[in-house]
């Protein structure tokens, strides 16, 4: 990507300091979606342009970032900054030429997926790994897969094991790992949400 | 501004194709799914399947399974539903749905297509 | 898959009174249920999420609580735009599915 960073950059560098000290206060109270955390005001408030970009990306990634980046403009009334830098990013969403379906593997980057976000945490919590697997079988998993997985002797190693195939699972996928964890350890995934 | 703009009503005979589309603007097509929900006349909503764009998989209700195909064109932004033969049955409204966020597969679909009115009749 | 049944199927009440819609799920969603309202010639609008949570924009006179199996939308004081068709769904599994509807109308 990269593309969309720039592009908030731009967006950033084009304030007035009046402005960008507004951009801020706003980024303090703006909805965020669910699972992504506030910048803290301290650090918020002292940030030039350069800086409040690098925390924007680190913090909502690059498509998000430049999609609040946006909503913020459009709320100060800079419709038409909002527009550019919306512009600026689709271009460099890796679309394919008009008329023709890029295939799957030349995708742009897609967002990243609860799984992926708490990988971490995933491996290391994850109790009723055999029910995941028994939920898993035979429509994400192969019958090699689950029994390289049950192979394993603790449950962070098998949850490590699981998360050794998901570079190859599409976003479907994912979501039925999801739904198996929600259905197996709901708890877990409340407290992931609040991280 | 999120948008989702379907397009227009359909009048068609049993056993002809249908292909319906659903054109997005207003954030980055490849972030979110994009879902299709059903609506007989008079009658309640029932969601049918959803396809991912950045990697173009779907997610089929098993009862639309194998009945309809969903689909993305990502140079255009736009989500397809489409029927091969279709059946006096298939007569009903369709909205295509975006949901609030799609980072946890929490699916609230906070914004809707104005519907497209698919009529089956010989 | 999970089944939704709302009640009643029809409320009818007058303006400034207050709406109870309740929603039961077969089995567990967790809090993982939505609400929307729906009127003739509509697409259907986004309400409540996740059992609580008020969608922007949505007035404060909506407001929604349960957790499990069984659910309620409330609305506080009525207005005269608020009669419609009222649908739950559920987001804790797969296929997603919806109540079969409360149709909210004027006594």
């Known amino acids: 990507m990269g593309r969309a960073r720039d592009a908030i950059l731009d967006a950033l560098e084009n304030l007035t300091a009046e402005e960008l000290k507004k951009f801020k206060l706003k980024l303090l109270s703006v909805p965020l979606r669910e699972g992504y955390g506030r910048i803290p005001r301290g650090a918020l408030l002292s940030m030039d342009a350069l800086d409040l970009t690098d925390k924007l990306v680190s913090f909502y990634l690059e498509t998000y970032g430049a999609e609040l980046t946006a909503n913020v403009l459009r709320d100060m009334g800079l419709q038409e900054m909002a527009g550019q830098l919306q512009a600026a990013t689709h271009q460099g969403s890796g679309a394919a030429p008009a008329g023709i379906q890029a295939p799957p593997q030349s995708a742009a980057k897609p967002g990243l997926h609860f799984i992926d976000q708490h990988r971490a945490a995933l491996i290391a919590r994850v109790t009723n790994v055999e029910w995941l697997l028994d939920a898993l079988y035979g429509k994400v998993l192969t019958d090699e897969q689950y029994q390289a997985v049950r192979a394993e002797p603790t449950n962070p190693s098998k949850m490590r094991k699981l998360f050794s195939f998901t570079p190859a699972w599409n976003w479907t996928c994912k979501d039925l790992l999801l739904q198996a964890l929600r259905e197996s350890q709901s708890y877990l995934v409340e407290d992931l949400e609040r991280s | 501004e999120v948008q989702l703009v379907q397009s227009g009503a359909e009048v068609k005979k049993p056993g002809e194709s249908l292909k319906i589309s659903c054109k997005i603007s207003g954030y980055s097509f490849t972030d979110q799914t994009i879902h299709w929900v059903h609506q007989m006349p008079g009658k309640g909503l029932e969601w049918m399947g959803y396809?991912?764009?950045?990697?173009?998989?779907?997610m089929y209700n098993e009862k639309f399974q194998g009945q309809v195909t969903i689909s993305a064109d990502k140079s255009i932004s736009t989500a397809y539903l489409q029927w091969s033969s279709l059946k006096a049955s298939d007569t009903a409204m369709y909205y295509c749905?975006?949901?609030?966020?799609?980072?946890?597969?929490?699916?609230?679909?906070?914004?809707w297509g104005q519907g497209t009115l698919v009529t089956v009749s010989s | 898959e999970i089944v939704l049944t709302q009640s009643p199927a029809t409320l009818s009440l007058s303006p400034g009174e207050r709406a109870t819609l309740s929603c039961h799920a077969s089995q567990n969603i967790n809090v993982y249920l939505s609400w929307y309202q729906q009127k003739p010639g509509q697409a259907p609008r986004l309400l409540i999420y996740k059992s609580s949570n008020l969608h922007t924009g949505i007035p404060a006179r909506f407001s929604g609580s349960g957790s499990g199996t069984d659910f309620t939308l409330t609305i506080s004081s009525l207005e005269p735009e608020d009669f419609a068709v009222y649908y739950c769904?559920?987001?804790?599994?797969?296929?997603?599915?919806f109540g079969q509807g409360t149709k909210l109308e004027i006594k």
């Open positions: 769904q559920q987001g804790q599994s797969y296929p997603l599915t």
């Open positions: 396809i991912y764009p950045g990697d173009g998989s779907a």
């Open positions: 749905a975006r949901p609030l966020y799609s980072y946890a597969s929490y699916y609230w679909f906070a914004y």
